[in-house]
Amino acid sequence: EVPQLTDLSFVDITDSSIGLRWTPLNSSTIIGYRITVVAAGEGIPIFEDFVDSSVGYYTVTGLEPGIDYDISVITLINGGESAPTTLTQQT
């Protein structure tokens, strides 16, 4: 089973950006994290990105003010991924 983040939190929230912080997992099999941003009620992410396994901070920019966003971080290994850790935040 692919390890899942448990400590995802929001920092530095503005009208158009949301900062994410988490503790990188200590496992040599992890190749990185996928970040997805979905406007609540929509069916696909409006934003996706990939970061290295050592990264524990990310800023999502270009967001619309006053909209609820479901933001997920998924742990990636070769050939698999974890369940998403998801938080909802309004800009």
Epitope: R34, A39, G41, E42, G43, P45, I46, E48, G66, I67
Partner: antibody, heavy 116, light 112 residues
Framework: QVQLVESGGGLVQPGGSLRLSCAAS????????MHWVRQAPGKGLEWVSV????????YYADSVKGRFTISRDNSKNTLYLQMNSLRAEDTAVYYC?????????WGQGTLVTVSS | DIALTQPASVSGSPGQSITISCTGT?????????VSWYQQHPGKAPKLMIY???KRPSGVSNRFSGSKSGNTASLTISGLQAEDEADYYC???????????FGGGTKLTVLG
């Protein structure tokens, strides 16, 4: 300026194939999900398919599932729609559209006519 | 599956206000919170007029406004002008599919 330009439409016989392209310019194409939407002559808008920015998420309308394939080449800033086993009811203007919250940018459309 | 129902046509005189309704039926898994509205003139591509129920893109006149009550979303156009004559479509997501759903469209006629 932000622009989407469709191409590849034309006349094709029932059962035939066609590949539509949508060239994007003026924005970071690789950051946006993209849709195909069609409109039969004199009819309303019908959603066809969507692909997320990375291609990780792909969905189709039931009416085209198994016959149409959406794809994208972010290095070429281009969206594609491969249409196989075409039917008369696929005759329509096909639009590509950018996914933000709502479809905020549309191409001018390309006409696909399926007829013998 | 979700279905979005719009009136086939509405009309109004210049300067008046009109409202176009968009009623969602059946379960949509929550996507109906993100209703958008599009304007389409004959032979032209659709144009986004309202998103996320009530938000207006930059460049769209403030005569256009959106709202939602229960399972019915509405587009209101105040101070009708001749150039407002067009087809209007509502759109949302069916999150159970997932898929995008459009209403059948409403033809707005500006009288006179």
């Amino acid at each position: 300026q932000v622009q989407l330009v469709e191409s590849g439409g034309g006349l094709v016989q029932p059962g035939g194939s066609l590949r539509l392209s949508c060239a994007a310019s003026g924005f970071t194409f690789s950051s946006y999900g993209m849709h195909w939407v069609r409109q039969a002559p004199g009819k309303g808008l019908e959603w066809v398919s969507v692909i997320s920015s990375s291609g990780s998420y792909i969905y189709y309308a039931d009416s085209v599932k198994g016959r149409f394939t959406i794809s994208r080449d972010n290095s070429k800033n281009t969206l594609y729609l491969q249409m196989n086993s075409l039917r008369a009811e696929d005759t329509a203007v096909y639009y590509c559209a950018r996914n933000k919250v709502g479809f905020d940018v549309w191409g001018q459309g390309t006409l696909v006519t399926v007829s013998s | 599956d979700i279905a979005l129902t719009q009136p086939a046509s509405v009309s109004g005189s210049p300067g008046q206000s009109i409202t176009i309704s968009c009623t969602g039926t059946s379960s949509d898994g929550g996507g109906y919170n993100t209703v958008s509205w599009y304007q389409q003139h004959p032979g032209k591509a659709p144009k986004l007029m309202i998103y996320y129920v009530h938000k207006r893109p930059s460049g769209v006149s403030n005569r256009f406004s959106g709202s939602k009550s229960g399972n019915t979303a509405s587009l209101t156009i105040s101070g009708l002008q001749a150039e407002d004559e067009a087809d209007y479509y509502c759109q949302s997501w069916d999150l159970l599919a997932p898929s995008v759903v459009f209403g059948g469209g409403t033809k707005l006629t500006v009288l006179g």
